[in-house]
């Protein structure tokens, strides 16, 4: 039976050009974590394998850094990074646990003007 739960950083709102850390934590289980995948929509960003360490997808190498821990650091954020991110914990013997984090990246002008929407 899968007893574990995933806690995440929570959803994040950030500014264009900045950086953020996405983190998940698996608790309430004694299962062994064999691998953690980080994905956005259907794209694989990075893998942290218990034996082989980190692998960052080539298309994200410039802007994605491993860690801290099993987390992932996204740098030089763009509006295109707005979206849902998944931490997928592969464990033995439990199986797979998934956490979801939504990242909102705001244009700096949007952030400065608050909730008053800007006419283009």
């Amino acid at each position: 039976m899968m007893t574990g739960t995933i806690e995440t950083t929570g959803n994040i709102s950030a500014e264009k050009g900045g950086s953020i850390i996405l983190q998940c934590h698996l608790s309430s289980t004694t299962a062994q974590v064999t691998q953690v995948n980080w994905e956005q929509q259907d794209q694989l960003l990075a893998i942290c394998n218990a034996d082989l360490g980190w692998h960052i997808s080539p298309s994200f190498k410039d802007r994605v850094a491993p860690g801290p821990g099993l987390g992932l650091t996204l740098q030089s954020l763009t509006v295109n990074d707005t979206g849902e991110y998944f931490c997928i914990y592969h464990t033995y013997p439990d199986g797979t646990y998934t956490g979801r984090i939504f990242l909102e990246v705001l244009e700096s002008s949007v952030a400065e003007h608050g909730a008053r929407f800007q006419i283009p």
Partner: antibody, heavy 118, light 112 residues
């Protein structure tokens, strides 16, 4: 002036699908996520999901995955929600709402009433 | 999913009253950066919901200062200092910190 103009009321038969449109004007369409909200029985509000008009990326409430499909047409600043395999449980008022995490759902469409009945 | 509990469900008032609506979440709404995405909405009959407060305590553009928001962690409050006729309707809180976003069940502000 910011406006979200939704398509009109719909009466559809069980098992059918339908698409609601939400045309945005008065602000930068790609700068804010577009959210969709269901109101059943004139009371409960439920978040269906959102779409990032900039890149078409979506995030769904798992409850509505397979029921709702969100898309956008950037050229016309219009967001769409298609509802599939309709049942009486889908009869509700559906709203589009522009905004996001930090600033809330700042602007709302007028709502589209969907009635599913044979 | 994060459960958002709103109390009371019904609030009978007289014009000029000061009232408070409570919103409690099943887990903390502060993310790892200390930001809390909690907003309040008023839904009047025959209209669309309207944003009153975002980020716990920030009044949206054009919202009168008789509306104020406060709270942290799991407990949040919307205060209306002097009830006016246009304030009657359903009030909802919305948490945006955890997926999926969830609304409270609503508080109906109605005349005594």
């Amino acid at each position: 002036e910011v406006q979200l103009q939704q398509s009109g009321p719909e009466l559809v038969k069980p098992g059918a699908s339908m698409k609601i449109s939400c045309k945005a004007s008065g602000y930068s369409f790609t700068g804010y996520t577009m959210n969709w909200v269901k109101q059943s029985h004139g009371k409960n509000l439920e978040w269906i999901g959102l779409i990032n008009p900039y890149n078409g990326g979506t995030s769904y409430n798992q409850k509505f995955k397979g029921k709702a499909t969100l898309t956008v047409d950037k050229s016309s600043s219009t967001a769409y929600m298609e509802l599939l395999s309709l049942t009486s449980e889908d009869s509700a008022v559906y709203y589009c709402a522009s905004g996001g995490l930090r600033y809330g759902f700042a602007y709302w469409g007028q709502g589209t009433t969907l009635t599913v009945s044979s | 999913d994060v459960v958002v509990t709103q109390t009371p469900l019904s609030l009978p008032v007289s014009f000029g009253d000061q009232v408070s609506i409570s919103c409690r979440s099943s887990q903390s709404l502060a993310n790892s950066y200390g930001n809390t995405y909690l907003s309040w909405y008023l839904h009047k009959p025959g209209q669309s919901p309207q944003l009153l407060i975002y980020g716990i305590s920030n009044r949206f553009s054009g919202v009168p200062d008789r509306f104020s928001g406060s709270g942290s962690g799991t407990d949040f409050t919307l205060k209306i200092s002097t009830i006016k006729p246009e304030d009657l309707g359903m009030y909802y809180c919305l948490q945006g910190t955890h997926q999926p976003l969830t609304f409270g069940a609503g508080t109906k502000l109605e005349l005594k």
